[in-house]
């Protein structure tokens, strides 16, 4: 069976860095060379003398880890023998994925007119791992203009709700600004638009000729 | 009720810097984000940015990106604006206000710029 | 950015007189959006129509707003002198935060 080499290192090393490396024996003491063979994504390189493996681009643990990469050492001179090891770099999250809305949310609406303030939910997630606990957002509006129609509560650590400060909405759309901050080292933050349409209502759904919308708010405080 | 005390009059010389405070009271501070606007002389009302107490995020009308710079401290419920490089063109009234609720302002801080 | 014209710039105006202010926006708004404020000389602006047609408190009923989309008005119905003022319509809808010119009112 293949001989398993194994690195770990963070997904924000600077490009340059020593990674890991390889070593091989030759029964006949002859030098060897290495090749990496598989590195579909182009992160590494391997010194064909000493097998020290290097990062040439930007890793990202979000692309899938560990990074599985073959080695080829191969005798200089003589029969050119060669033997294949596998090296299984491991990269360790860094907070680098900003907050997104965790689903697409065109879909929601209010029934217009409003007779009593209304709210709706919507979640956050992002792609980095989160050890321990789950994320921990917090949630606030991306702009001081949107305070007098809208408010942002936070319910858990991924969902929140927004809620409308009066009913004087005219039937059309609403962009409301969202901040999503996930509280990590370095914190990161997202900026999220949701669109709020204010329609006209048939049983409880946005009456659109050209379809049906889907996502129902909860209406009252 | 609800107050904004700004900084007194200010006169500087062309390429110097001013900081203008606003003095915050009868409400919670890091509730309400903190509106900037300009008033030159004989012109349009100007908004120049905002800023979220709670957490100094801002907002800046691009027109006043690298001219203003928006802050808070918290512990002062104060809020701070900042104006760099000083010119002729920057001497104006310039007032803190509560968007929230759309009414409140404070009573106006003269820049005048003069060599 | 959105634009805010008003119309006239300025009217000399005689007491008991109705007086029509109109703001015209570059692009369409809600009417949630549109507010209008007074300034007197050496004092701050000050609130009289938020959400188009709100009274701002303390306001006296002769101040009434309307329009919708593109189209705003401040009207005041029966001028006092106290009314003698800059009149600013803003909108809120969109980064930056944008005004009309002023509207200037003499009272004759």
């Known amino acids: 069976s293949q001989h398993v080499f194994q690195a770990k290192v963070s997904e924000d090393v600077a490009i340059g860095t020593k990674v890991g490396n390889v070593t091989a024996k030759d029964p006949e003491g002859l030098d060897i060379s290495y090749s990496l063979r598989g590195d579909t994504r182009g992160w590494l390189k391997i010194d064909h003398v000493t097998g020290e493996i290097f990062s040439v681009a930007p890793l990202d643990r979000e692309a899938g880890s560990p990074y599985r990469v073959q080695v080829v050492a191969t005798e200089v001179g003589g029969s050119s023998l060669s033997s294949v090891s596998e090296f299984h770099l491991i990269l360790m999250d860094v907070n680098d994925n900003p907050p997104r809305l965790a689903k697409d949310y065109t879909g929601l609406f209010f029934c217009h007119p409003l007779s009593a303030p209304g709210s709706l939910i919507f979640e956050a997630t992002d792609d980095d791992q989160h050890l321990f606990r789950g994320p921990h957002f917090t949630f606030s509006l991306g702009s001081g203009s949107l305070q007098n129609d809208w408010e942002v509560s936070k319910i858990n650590g991924t969902h929140a709700r927004l809620s409308t400060r009066h009913t004087e909405f005219e039937e059309r759309e609403y962009v409301v600004l969202i901040r999503i901050n996930d509280g990590g080292r370095p914190p990161l933050e997202g900026i999220v638009s949701l669109p709020v349409t204010f329609c006209s209502c048939v049983e409880g759904s946005c009456f659109r000729p050209a379809g049906h919308q889907t996502g129902i708010p909860t209406v009252g405080m | 009720q609800v107050q904004l005390v700004q900084s007194g009059a200010e006169v500087k010389k062309p390429g110097a810097s001013v900081k203008v405070s606003c003095k915050a009271s009868?409400?919670?501070?890091?509730?309400?984000?903190m509106h900037w606007v300009k008033q030159a002389p004989g012109q349009r009302l100007e908004w120049i940015g905002e800023?979220?107490?709670?957490?100094?995020?801002?907002n800046y009308n691009q027109k006043f990106k690298g001219k203003a710079t928006l802050t808070v401290d918290k512990s002062a419920s104060t809020a701070y604006m900042e104006l760099s490089s000083l010119r002729s063109e920057d001497t104006a009234v310039y007032y803190c206000?509560?968007?929230?609720?759309?009414?409140?302002w404070g009573q106006g801080t003269t820049v005048t710029v003069s060599s | 950015e959105i634009v805010l014209t008003q119309s006239p710039d300025f009217q000399s105006v005689t007491p008991k007189e109705k007086v029509t202010i109109t703001c015209s926006v570059s692009?369409?708004?809600?009417?949630?959006?549109l507010h209008w404020y007074q300034q007197k000389p050496d004092q701050s602006p000050k609130l009289l129509i938020k959400?188009?047609?709100n009274l701002a408190s303390g306001v006296p009923s002769r101040f009434s707003g309307s329009g919708s989309g593109t189209d705003f008005t401040l009207t005041i119905n029966s001028l006092e002198a106290e009314d003698a003022a800059t009149y600013y319509c803003?909108?809120?809808?969109?980064?930056?935060?944008?005004f009309g010119q002023g509207t200037r009112l003499e009272i004759k």
């Open positions: 206000a509560l968007y929230y609720g759309y009414g409140d």
């Open positions: 803003q909108q809120g809808s969109n980064l930056p935060l944008t």
């Open positions: 692009s369409s708004i809600s009417s949630i959006h």
């Open positions: 800023i979220d107490p709670s957490d100094s995020y801002a």
């Open positions: 959400r188009t047609s």
């Open positions: 009868g409400y919670t501070f890091t509730t309400y984000w």
